[in-house]
């Protein structure tokens, strides 16, 4: 039987990228079940290193499975994790029935802007924003919310929040007491 | 035909390094995916690191990773693994084997092998 092309065996191969807070620099992860051999960069235990935020870098993969053409990999870096904060931007008067998170670019970065997408779950509930509102919620109980951020639909940080919603106003307490 | 010969143990204190060296002859050294194993005594063989045919991709075990580092010559056929701040637990026979297909670090997955060269860490 005839073997693949590389750029056909490893068509659909998906890319983690990894940050280090310290040098801040992005290791790109490569997600494949075998040893691949990596052109114009090194490739350590899959891994490509030394990445910089923003910059784009091209990997060739391939393997003696498969014949050329080699799969070439654009790795879209991401821009650094630090740039990002997620924020609590609940209003203190309705913080006993709200809850708002919103992230906040907290440094410039050069990576297109339009690539980078947000996405929270509180529960069950699922939101592709950069800030979120929960209305109408109960007084005095603990909400949390995982997000995410991702670039070119890799996701390249994340956080979670557990909120405690504020005492209700002394009128809701005694409905709530009456309801139970 | 694949004829593999390590060189460069022996005995080194704690702290300190070698250089192993394979040398290859009897086929086309660059066609081959090049992978260093060890055995201490009573315990099975495990993987160590292993090379790509350019040398473009390495991997090493946990164990090793920031210690040991592998290259290669193809122009000199040879494959090199050079192990810094040795500790007792590397003591073990090193043998360096050769993979024509390469898919992973599993010992089986190499069809030739040197006869080894023992490594001891002790003070």
């Known amino acids: 039987p005839s073997k693949p092309t590389c750029d056909e065996k490893y068509a659909n191969i998906t890319v983690d990228y990894l940050y280090n807070k310290e040098t801040k620099l992005f290791t790109a992860k490569l997600n494949v079940n075998e040893n691949v051999e990596c052109g114009n960069n090194t490739c350590t235990n899959n891994e490509v290193h030394n990445l910089t935020e923003c910059k784009n870098a091209s990997v060739s993969i391939s393997h003696n499975s498969c014949t050329a053409p080699d799969k070439t990999l654009i790795l879209d870096v991401p821009p650094g994790v630090e740039k990002f904060q997620l924020h609590d931007c609940t209003q203190v008067e309705k913080a006993d029935t709200t809850i708002c998170l919103k992230w906040k670019n907290i440094e410039t970065f050069t990576c297109d802007t339009q690539n980078i997408t947000y996405r929270f779950q509180c529960g069950n509930m699922i939101f592709d924003n950069k800030e979120i509102k929960l209305e109408n919620l109960e007084p005095e109980h603990e909400y949390k919310c995982d997000s995410e951020i991702l670039y070119n639909n890799h996701k390249f940080t994340n956080a979670s929040k557990i909120i405690k919603t504020d005492f209700g106003s002394p009128e809701q307490k005694l409905i709530s007491e009456e309801d139970l | 035909q694949v004829q593999l010969q390590e060189s460069g143990g022996g005995l080194v204190q704690p702290g300190g390094s070698l250089r192993l060296s394979c040398a290859a002859s009897?086929?086309?050294?660059?066609?081959?995916?090049m992978g260093w194993f060890r055995q201490a005594p009573g315990k099975e063989r495990e993987f160590v690191s292993s090379?790509?045919?350019?040398?473009?991709?390495?991997y090493y075990a946990g164990a090793v990773r920031g210690r040991f580092t592998i290259s290669r010559d193809n122009a000199k056929n040879t494959v090199y693994l050079q192990m810094n701040s040795l500790q007792p637990e590397d003591t073990a026979v090193y043998y360096c084997?050769?993979?024509?297909?390469?898919?992973?670090?599993?010992?089986?997955?190499?069809?030739?092998w040197g006869q080894g060269t023992l490594v001891t860490v002790s003070s």
């Open positions: 084997a050769a993979s024509s297909t390469w898919n992973n670090n599993d010992p089986t997955e190499y069809e030739y």
């Open positions: 009897g086929g086309t050294f660059s066609d081959y995916g």
């Open positions: 090379i790509s045919w350019s040398g473009n991709s390495v």
